[in-house]
């Protein structure tokens, strides 16, 4: 529990883990996406669609739940890093 | 241990601009999110903006997003404020804050005068 | 942006007083994201509580906070000359983090 913790532990660079999973309204999981120019591989829709989804960490798509993560920097916290925690 | 140089003050003529430095140790500067704070002589704190030293992404107050931009030189470890334009309401200590707030630099007092 | 309204704005306490500083927010912010700090005359200010109730490194036991929602406090047990400062109250809660108007501590 963040509430909790030691202001110590949040001292490392990122967390080893999302702090939080969102999944955005207006997913489209009807709709096939075009995948990459032979590659057979989709593009990270943390670069384009969710680019500017986690405002104080970095974003991680998790493809089994069709939603953005965010890894947050130290400090941070929520589900898009949008709290200063201490 | 953490620490957060900035110079002791600058006098500046109204209408000009001026870019206060605050240089940081002891940590991974491209880490951690660096934050600007304004308290005016007497007065309180305002939160100005910060700045993700590691790719240069700010947040900014919108009361100061036309008088200060934030900006880093990494290879430095130095972060930076300019503010431009400047009139007495300028005239305040400007801190740098590391982005756990456990550490504040001694402040820069800017003191707007012709 | 969120507004934090602290109260009193000025106070004096004679020494072993028991002190509490409010800070009501304009609208409801997480426990996580209410933090505390003192400065005193000529000093850049220092983290006292994060957390709403959690005391930052070296600050002393007699140093308290609660609260949730819109209502925070900040409370010191015993009253001590070294706690003369003005305290205020900061919301980490959204963009612009903002800070109280602040809370000047004197001793009587």
């Known amino acids: 529990d963040l509430q909790e913790a030691d202001l110590d532990l949040l001292r490392v660079t990122l967390s080893s883990k999302p702090q939080a999973l969102a999944t955005p309204n207006k997913e489209e999981h009807g709709k096939r996406k075009k995948k990459g120019k032979g590659l057979g591989k989709k593009r990270d829709p943390c670069l384009r669609k969710y680019k500017d989804f986690c405002i104080h960490g970095e974003c991680k798509y998790v493809k089994e739940l069709r939603a953005p993560s965010c890894i947050c920097h130290p400090g941070y916290h929520g589900e898009r890093c949008h709290g200063l925690s201490l | 241990q953490v620490q957060l140089q900035q110079p002791g003050a600058e006098l500046v003529k109204p209408g000009a601009s001026v870019k206060l430095s605050c240089k940081a140790s002891?940590?991974?500067?491209?880490?951690?999110?660096m934050h600007w704070v304004k308290q005016r002589p007497g007065q309180g704190l305002e939160w100005i903006g910060e700045?993700?030293?590691?790719?240069?992404?700010?947040n900014y107050n919108e009361k100061f997003k036309s008088k200060a931009t934030l900006t880093v030189d990494k290879s430095s470890s130095t972060a930076y404020m300019q503010l431009s334009s400047l009139t007495s309401e300028d005239s305040a200590v400007y801190y740098c804050?590391?982005?756990?707030?456990?550490?504040w630099g001694q402040g820069t007092t800017l003191t707007v005068s012709s | 942006e969120i507004v934090l309204t602290q109260s009193p704005t000025t106070m004096a306490a004679s020494p072993g007083e028991k002190i509490t500083i409010t800070c009501s927010a304009s609208?409801?912010?997480?426990?996580?994201?209410l933090h505390w700090y003192q400065q005193k005359p000529g000093f850049s200010p220092k983290l006292l509580i994060y957390?709403?109730?959690n005391l930052a490194s070296g600050v002393p036991a007699r140093f308290s906070g609660s609260g949730s929602g819109t209502s925070y406090s900040l409370t010191i047990g015993t009253m001590e000359a070294e706690d003369v400062a003005t305290y205020y109250c900061?919301?980490?809660?959204?963009?612009?983090?903002?800070f109280g108007s602040g809370t000047k501590l004197e001793i009587k």
């Open positions: 804050v590391w982005s756990l707030f456990d550490y």
């Open positions: 002891g940590y991974t500067f491209t880490s951690y999110w």
């Open positions: 700045i993700n030293p590691s790719n240069g992404r700010t």
């Open positions: 609208s409801s912010i997480s426990s996580n994201y």
């Open positions: 957390r709403t109730s």
């Open positions: 900061q919301q980490g809660s959204s963009i612009p983090f903002t």
